[in-house]
C-alpha cells in the first residue's frame, strides 16, 4: 500500500532512501523542453520475487518541438535547478548500495531526465535524513522516518534530527547519536501492531553507507 | 485556452456532504492527471488528492482519506471530488488543477501542476 503522505520535512535537510520497497513507483520526469514520449510509460514500478527485484517499464523523453523523436542534449549546470518539491530527490546512484532482498537499488538516470525524482513510496520503507551543506546534525536520535500502518492509516515516524546553522557538514550516517528519550517520540506505538521486518537491516545497511550519496543543492 | 472551472461548493453542516466538480476545456483529461487542493484562510495551499488517468496511482493527503474520494470522468472531461464526514478544518477554497506527468502529491507539490482553475469556497459549520 502506498504511503498517504511523504516523509517529514526537515529544515535545512534532506532525505534520501537506500533502497526502495517492491511496489515503489517513481514518476517519469523530464526536464524542461522535454517530455514524456506519448506512448511512454508514467511511472517505474519497483517489482520482484524473493530472489531478485528490479525496475519494470522505462522511462523515455523527447523534445518538447520535435515530438516523438528523442533528443540526446547534456544538461547544461544552470538547466540543473528548476522546482524544487520535498519528495523530489536527486537521481545519484550510491556507489556501494547493498542488495536488499524486496528492494530496487537507486533506478540509472534515463535522458533527458528531471533534475529531481519523484517516488511514491509503499509502507515499510525507510529514508534517511542529512543536513544540507553549511549545517551540522545535532541528533535525538535516529536520523531516518519509517512508513508504517497503524490502524489502517499510514504515517511516517518523525525523524529525531536538528539541523544547525554552524558552517560544517554533517557526517552521516556515521555520527555518534543519544538514544531517543521517550519524549522525543510523540507518536504512540504501543496500542497498534506494526510490523518491522527489514528495518533493522536497513539501519545496519544505512551503518555503512557513504555521504556521497546525499547530495547538497537542497539549500 | 485551458480552462478548468469548480462548481458544487457551498455551505454545510458539519457531518454532511459535498461533491465538487471541475469541468475542463483546451485539454483533454485523459490523458492528464487531475487533483485538488485547497487553501484555508491564512494558510498555505494543501494537497488532498490526486489521480492519473490510467487510474494506475490514487493518491489522498492523509487527513482525508477515507472520507473523501477523487473521480474522473474522462469522455465527459470533468474530475470530481466527492466530500464526505466533512469537519469545521474542511473549510478552504478548493482548487482543482491537471499536469501532463504522473501524480505528484505532497506538501509542496502543487509546482509541478500546469494548470489551474480559479476555486470554489466549501464552507462547513459546526
Known amino acids: 500500500e502506498l504511503c498517504d503522505d511523504d516523509p517529514p520535512e526537515i529544515p535545512h535537510a534532506t532525505f534520501k532512501a537506500m533502497a526502495y520497497k517492491e511496489g515503489t513507483m517513481l514518476n517519469c520526469e523530464c526536464k524542461r523542453g522535454f517530455r514524456r514520449i506519448k506512448s511512454g510509460s508514467l511511472y517505474m514500478l519497483c517489482t520482484g520475487n524473493s530472489s531478485h527485484s528490479s525496475w519494470d517499464n522505462q522511462c523515455q523523453c523527447t523534445s518538447s518541438a520535435t515530438r516523438n523523436t528523442t533528443k540526446q542534449v547534456t544538461p547544461q549546470p544552470e538547466e540543473q535547478k528548476e522546482r524544487k518539491t520535498t519528495e523530489m530527490q536527486s537521481p545519484m546512484q550510491p556507489v556501494d548500495q547493498a542488495s536488499l532482498p524486496g528492494h530496487c537499488r537507486e533506478p540509472p538516470p534515463w535522458e533527458n531526465e528531471a533534475t529531481e525524482r519523484i517516488y511514491h513510496f509503499v509502507v515499510g520503507q525507510m529514508v534517511y535524513y542529512q543536513c544540507v551543506q553549511g549545517y551540522r546534525a545535532l541528533h535525538r536520535g535516529p536520523a531516518e522516518s519509517v512508513c508504517k500502518m497503524t490502524h489502517g492509516k499510514t504515517r511516517w515516524t518523525q525523524p529525531q534530527l536538528i539541523c544547525t546553522g554552524e558552517m560544517e557538514t554533517s557526517q552521516f550516517p556515521g555520527e555518534e547519536k543519544p538514544q531517543a528519550s521517550p519524549e522525543g517520540r510523540p507518536e504512540s506505538e504501543t496500542s497498534c501492531l506494526v510490523t518491522t521486518t527489514d528495518f533493522q537491516i536497513q539501519t545496519e545497511m544505512a551503518a555503512t553507507m557513504e555521504t556521497s550519496i546525499f547530495t547538497t543543492e537542497y539549500q | 485556452q485551458v480552462q478548468l472551472v469548480e462548481s458544487g461548493g457551498g455551505l454545510v453542516q458539519a457531518g454532511g456532504s459535498l461533491r465538487l466538480s471541475c469541468a475542463a476545456s483546451?485539454?483533454?483529461?485523459?490523458?492528464?492527471?487531475m487533483a485538488w487542493f485547497r487553501q484555508a484562510p491564512g494558510k498555505e495551499r494543501e494537497f488532498v488528492a490526486a489521480?492519473?488517468?490510467?487510474?494506475?496511482?490514487?493518491r489522498y493527503a492523509s487527513s482525508v482519506k477515507g472520507r473523501f474520494t477523487i473521480s474522473r470522468d474522462n469522455a465527459g472531461n470533468t474530475g470530481f471530488l466527492q466530500m464526505n464526514s466533512l469537519r469545521p478544518e474542511d473549510t478552504a477554497v478548493y482548487y482543482c488543477?491537471?499536469?501532463?506527468?504522473?501524480?505528484?502529491?505532497?506538501?509542496?507539490?502543487?509546482?509541478?501542476?500546469?494548470?489551474w482553475g480559479q476555486g470554489t469556497q466549501v464552507t462547513v459549520s459546526s
Open positions: 488543477a491537471a499536469r501532463e506527468g504522473g501524480v505528484v502529491a505532497g506538501v509542496r507539490s502543487g509546482a509541478p501542476y500546469d494548470y
Open positions: 483546451g485539454i483533454t483529461f485523459n490523458d492528464h492527471t
Open positions: 489521480r492519473d488517468w490510467s487510474d494506475i496511482i490514487t
